[in-house]
Interface confidence: low
Amino acid sequence: GIAIPRNSGCPNSEDKNFPRTVMVNLNIHNRNTSTNPKRSSDYYNRSTSPWNLHRNEDPERYPSVIWEAKCRHLGCVKADGNVDYHMNSVPIQQEILVLRREPRHCPNSFRLEKILVSVGCTCVTPIVHHVA
Amino acid sequence: GIAIPRNSGCPNSEDKNFPRTVMVNLNIHNRNTSTNPKRSSDYYNRSTSPWNLHRNEDPERYPSVIWEAKCRHLGCVKADGNVDYHMNSVPIQQEILVLRREPRHCPNSFRLEKILVSVGCTCVTPIVHHVA
């Protein structure tokens, strides 16, 4: 991380392992003042690599609900609606940060956790290895 | 949010706005014990809706570096390598949580923030209305 100068206007920390444990305000600030117009809400259906969204819920996590994408087909959908198995539908994955209650059930103590989620699917050309 | 019972083994909080401000341990626990074998590292190049990755850096944010996808074409790449403008490359976007230093430059005080990031691109059929 970046070395940040100490600032007299900052909250104090008594933690001997500081800055490993920090104070976090859970009043979420949303940087996206309006929904992005290029809305992805229906892309899961219109994509040549369509996907279904599955609800992943965990009350010990913040956010407790995360939606996971699962590609519908192994191949990609052609203009005629049939699946082309010479192409592959693959999940686009992203590592995201979540807060995990630690110790368990504690309302005000969390550990930062990285989880891998599938956000959607894309159609790729398969890697084919030809033996000489 | 979920109502969590108070637990005698939990750290105490003196914050009058509790549980809006919580303690977070920044020693990240990575739930993905091994790198996902279906790694998406080269999908950006092999996709029919390929994308470039742009580095978005902000020292006041945690994580400070986020990679943003930007679709390379308006259309989608056909098997012959040409772009088909009857189809559209669109970004798959996801809202993610980050920590924003607040007050600014403070090393041990953060606010949770939601930001919208483009993770990759997918190829979709455009919405077109034909007048009878």
């Epitope: 003042t33 809305r39 | 308006l74 919405i127």
Partner: antibody, heavy 124, light 111 residues
Framework: EVQLLESGGGVVQPGRSLRLSCAAS????????MHWVRQAPGKGLEWVAV????????YYADSVKGRFTISRDNSKNTLYLEMNSLRPEDTAVYYC?????????????????WGQGTTVTVSS | QSVLTQPPSASGTPGQTVSISCSGR????????VDWYQQVPGAAPKLLMY???IRPSGVPDRFSGSQSGTSASLAISGLQSEDEADYYC???????????FGSGTKVTVLG
């Protein structure tokens, strides 16, 4: 020929209202997102509002939010801008413009067709 | 004050190359594609470039566009007298939730 024709401009007192119209021809109007853009005398272009092809989504510049309303009537091939609580700083030439791609695009293909503009003067 | 910054003016003699910059931030140029418009005095704007570097049909190949990071630029090579006009960059801005125009650059052809 693809054409956009604005009308409804004029001189109006501060605090009053005005409704601009933009008649579209030569393309399937209901397929395209539409914008209003204005230009004050001697100044640069300022984006005002956009509406999706089906009218379900609308976005406004902060300077007009809560005062202006963009709407469309696809059966009449017409785009509208309802302007309330007008201020002297709203004085400008108002252009309507068409998004360059059909469907759920707001800007990616640029604004490829513009009207000739209609002048709005807000003065007491 | 526009969120997309352009130089107020640029000039060159016929045949020269003139470049116009457009500086933005992550929420606009960093994430979205840039359009360029040309406006000659007394006329409506005309789309000159979209998607950073694609010219609509009818726009001469003397005009070229590029983008890098949070900046974009328009180059006019082989400058001609009819290129004398105001040029605006534009794109979507996620923070503002709207389309934004640059401050505009007046291009003058000298001599």
């Amino acid at each position: 020929e693809v054409q956009l024709l604005e009308s409804g401009g004029g001189v109006v007192q501060p605090g009053r209202s005005l409704r601009l119209s933009c008649a579209a021809s030569g393309f399937i109007f209901s397929n395209y997102g539409m914008h209003w853009v204005r230009q004050a005398p001697g100044k640069g272009l300022e984006w005002v509002a956009v509406i999706s092809y089906d009218g379900s989504n609308k976005y406004y510049a902060d300077s007009v939010k809560g005062r202006f309303t963009i709407s469309r009537d696809n059966s009449k091939n017409t785009l509208y801008l309802e302007m309330n609580s007008l201020r002297p700083e709203d004085t400008a030439v108002y252009y309507c413009a068409k998004v360059g791609a059909s469907g759920d695009y707001y800007y990616s293909y640029g604004l490829d067709v513009w009207g000739q503009g209609t002048t709005v003067t807000v003065s007491s | 004050q526009s969120v997309l910054t352009q130089p107020p003016s640029a000039s060159g003699t016929p045949g020269q190359t003139v470049s116009i910059s457009c500086s933005g931030r992550q929420s606009n140029i960093g994430r979205h594609y840039v359009d360029w418009y040309q406006q000659v005095p007394g006329a409506a704007p005309k789309l000159l470039m979209y998607y950073d570097s694609i010219r609509p049909s009818g726009v001469p190949d003397r005009f070229s566009g590029s983008q890098s990071g949070t900046s974009a630029s328009l180059a006019i090579s082989g400058l001609q007298s009819e290129d004398e006009a105001d040029y605006y960059c534009a794109t979507w801005d996620d923070s503002l939730g709207g389309y934004v125009f640059g401050s505009g650059t007046k291009v003058t052809v000298l001599g």
